[in-house]
């Protein structure tokens, strides 16, 4: 969490941003909030990016003002116009690109004053893993698959029964480049699986950590998966 204050001229207002991550090819949100104003026409929002000459986005007098918008963001940005009046200056970024990563500034002017805060935005690819029993294999085998990751993640297997065990000798992980030549499909196979146990396939890079669990008993198979972004710090 980054909290910034305005300085010179008028009074300062508090602006708060939260570091976040974008999943390339999907839409992302750059979060920013500020002390609200009662008049929308008095609010100016500017988003800037370090190393980019034009503005990322500008909103003033109740509407977008994109005459100075940088080419790399053209047609890809929007604020939540109906929420600006309550202090939400968050930016929606469409079709996140790897090159969108970097340091952004949310700069606000209201009738109360000015303020700004920076935000670190990471980009990559992350997806939920799915763990299945591989019935084609000669021994009891689990197969963990996740369709899109970047940068290349690490994959670690764990088991509820054999806590602390190292499964690297009985597992094999491969990374297959997807058609857009950036993200990769992750496939990890775990051999010599025992029944009545819960296994976890953990995939992690510097942006996200995802876990796929599978519980195999003689009568049923239960699956669960979850994904956590690693860098959500507020400023």
């Amino acid at each position: 969490l980054i909290i910034g204050f305005g300085i010179s001229g008028r009074h300062s207002i508090t602006v708060t941003t939260v570091a976040s991550a974008g999943n390339i090819g999907e839409d992302g949100i750059l979060s920013c909030t500020f002390e609200p104003d009662i008049k929308l026409s008095d609010i100016v929002i500017q988003w800037l990016k370090e190393g980019v000459l034009g503005l990322v986005h500008e909103f003033k007098e109740g509407k977008d003002e994109l005459s100075e918008q940088d080419e790399m963001f053209r047609g890809r940005t929007a604020v939540f116009a109906d929420q600006v009046i309550v202090g939400n200056a968050s930016l929606r970024l469409k079709n996140v690109q790897l090159t969108d990563a970097g340091t952004y500034k949310c700069y606000i002017i209201t009738s109360k004053g000015k303020g700004n805060a920076n935000l670190e935005y990471k980009t990559g690819a992350f997806s939920m893993p799915e763990v299945n029993v591989d019935y084609n294999a000669s021994s009891e085998t689990l197969r963990c698959e996740a369709p899109r990751w970047f940068p290349q993640p690490t994959v670690v297997w764990a088991s509820q029964v054999d806590q602390g065990a190292n499964f690297s000798e009985v597992s094999n992980t491969s990374f297959e480049l997807n058609s857009e030549n950036v993200t990769m499909k992750v496939v990890s196979v775990l051999y010599n699986v025992t029944i009545n146990n819960t296994y976890s396939c953990m995939i992690e890079n510097d942006i996200a950590k995802a876990t796929g669990d599978i519980k195999v008993t003689e009568s049923e198979i239960k699956r669960r998966s979850h994904l956590q972004l690693l860098n959500s710090k507020a400023s």
Epitope: L48, E50, G51, V52, L53, Y107
Partner: nanobody, 122 residues
């Protein structure tokens, strides 16, 4: 106050070279990315190149890639644009600009120099 003064423009033949310079003052030069852009009369400004404060990162528009080189000298508060193999379509007013991103940024801040004219003609 940010001040940027470009120089080095002139008339050059197709295939020729020019080196543009930009003298910066009024801010902590080495902390900022610097940019070059150009404008043909009647058209919008076109960004062409940028360089990070430590010179470790540079990038170029496709239209100038392989022909133009950006550099800087933080001791002298100078940024340069070496232009080789110039073409008629490179004719424009060339502007040096400071990155907006910084603690001193304010609404309406002028980050541009006044420009220097480059004419490529035989």
């Amino acid at each position: 106050e940010v001040q940027l003064v470009e120089s080095g423009g002139g008339l050059v033949q197709p295939g020729g070279s020019l080196r543009l310079s930009c003298a910066a003052s009024g801010f902590a030069f080495s902390n900022y990315w610097m940019h070059w852009a150009r404008q043909v009369p009647g058209k919008g400004r076109e960004w062409i190149s940028r360089i990070s404060g430590d010179s470790e990162s540079t990038s170029y528009a496709d239209s100038v890639k392989g022909r133009f080189t950006i550099s800087r000298d933080n001791a002298k508060n100078m940024v340069y644009l070496q232009m080789n193999n110039l073409r008629a379509e490179d004719t424009a007013v060339y502007y040096c600009a400071r990155d907006r991103f910084g603690d001193d940024y304010y609404y309406g801040m002028n980050v541009w120099g006044q420009g220097t004219t480059v004419t490529v003609s035989s």
